[in-house]
């Protein structure tokens, strides 16, 4: 089970209308450039076999991957939203740095790996898709971690 006290984000992180709006605007702009609507990264398969108490830990992994492998490499795109949203998400990632799981997290890593593989397989369009799903990442992170 997770060390649940550390796998928590304060509700106030998600009660900032400006940055919430900017995150959703960024997602909307990127989704307009996403021509692969058949694939969804953040959906049922990602959470398959993951208990309620493990959801935040899973979302932490997804957030870190999205920052490091998607947002940082694409940081020059989708301005001015990107320059505001990336530091916000990085702060959330930092606040979850002590969120760990005691015991086996193989099932979680397997699910996250599938998401990573999908993004990598699609190349740049996979990265655009991930940015286009930042609204889902934001909401899923909120729902899992508050």
């Amino acid at each position: 089970a997770p060390i649940s006290s550390h796998c928590r984000l304060d509700k106030s992180n998600f009660q900032q209308p400006y940055i919430t709006n900017r995150t959703f605007m960024l997602a909307k702009e990127a989704s307009l450039a996403d021509n692969n609507t058949d694939v969804r990264l953040i959906g049922e398969k990602l959470f398959h076999g993951v208990s309620m108490s493990e959801r935040c830990y899973l979302m932490k992994q997804v957030l870190n991957f999205t920052l490091e492998e998607v947002l940082f490499p694409q940081s020059d795109r989708f301005q001015p939203y990107m320059q505001e949203v990336v530091p916000f998400l990085a702060r959330l990632s930092n606040r979850l740095s002590t969120c760990h799981i005691e015991g086996d997290d193989l099932h979680i890593q397997r699910n996250v790996q599938k998401l990573k593989d999908t993004v990598k397989k699609l190349g740049e369009s996979g990265e655009i898709k991930a940015i286009g799903e930042l609204d889902l990442l934001f909401m899923s992170l909120r729902n899992a971690c508050i």
Partner: antibody, heavy 116, light 112 residues
Framework: QSVEESGGRLVTPGTPLTLTCTVS????????MIWVRQAPGEGLEWIGI?????STYYASWAKGRFTISRTSTTVDLKITSPTTGDTATYFC?????????????WGPGTLVTVSS | AVVLTQTASPVSAPVGGTVTIKCQAS??????LAWYQQKPGQPPKLLIY???TLASGVPSRFKGSGSGTEFTLTISDLECADAATYYC??????????????FGGGTEVVVK
């Protein structure tokens, strides 16, 4: 992938009753399951949920009145001491978390009538 | 606990027409709202989640919108088969788990 409830019947007040939800086509080790009830002519009312790891959570009004448990293929709802107000159709449904909880599919329901 | 208030029943419209059902939440639930359709003698059926995402197999005549506290389900090109009661359902996270899932009171749609 389907769920089906059974065990509903006419009982007298105070007589414990256990309803069973049988699942097929998916594993209870991968999905949480919820119980919802609907009194005749009324709306839907969430009772409780059993998570993948066996943890249970109940609506505030349902605590102490209901107990949810499971085996590898079934989820049970025990009505500990039924009253006439517990007369309803009881549904179970699979909880699919997609970043938010959604309930699908639902069983056809089983009718419980509590009367003296 | 969040309270969901739906459009009063019944709402009626002719075949081929459009109906709009509103669902108002007593607190901000972001986009954590789903819509279910229930026909007499049947269980509820998932229509929409994330406030606007169509569930698999649901016709595009069904459209969900809204966020925060105001949500709408619109059914266009009404068919006789759309006659049913529609429920909104919210997920509220971060509070006690004993009030996480809430249903609205339901709105009956009559197709003339």
């Amino acid at each position: 992938q389907s769920v089906e409830e059974s065990g509903g019947r006419l009982v007298t007040p105070g007589t414990p009753l256990t309803l069973t939800c049988t699942v097929s086509g998916f594993s209870l080790s991968s999905y949480a399951m919820i119980w919802v009830r609907q009194a005749p002519g009324e709306g839907l009312e969430w009772i409780g949920i059993i998570d993948i790891d066996g943890s249970t959570y109940y609506a505030s009004w349902a605590k102490g009145r209901f107990t949810i448990s499971r085996t590898s293929t079934t989820v049970d709802l025990k009505i500990t001491s039924p009253t006439t107000g517990d007369t309803a159709t009881y549904f179970c449904a699979r909880d699919r978390f997609v970043g938010v909880d959604i309930f699908d599919p639902w069983g056809p329901g089983t009718l419980v009538t509590v009367s003296s | 606990a969040v309270v969901l208030t739906q459009t009063a029943s019944p709402v009626s419209a002719p075949v081929g027409g459009t109906v709009t059902i509103k669902c108002q939440a007593s607190e901000d639930i972001y986009t954590n709202l789903a819509w279910y359709q229930q026909k007499p003698g049947q269980p509820p059926k998932l229509l929409i989640y994330w406030a606007s995402t169509l569930a698999s197999g649901v016709p595009s005549r069904f459209k969900g919108s809204g966020s925060g506290t105001e949500f709408t389900l619109t059914i266009s090109d009404l068919e006789c088969a759309d006659a049913a009661t529609y429920y909104c359902q919210a997920c509220v996270y971060g509070n006690s788990a004993d009030s996480r899932y809430t249903f609205g009171g339901g709105t009956e749609v009559v197709v003339k």
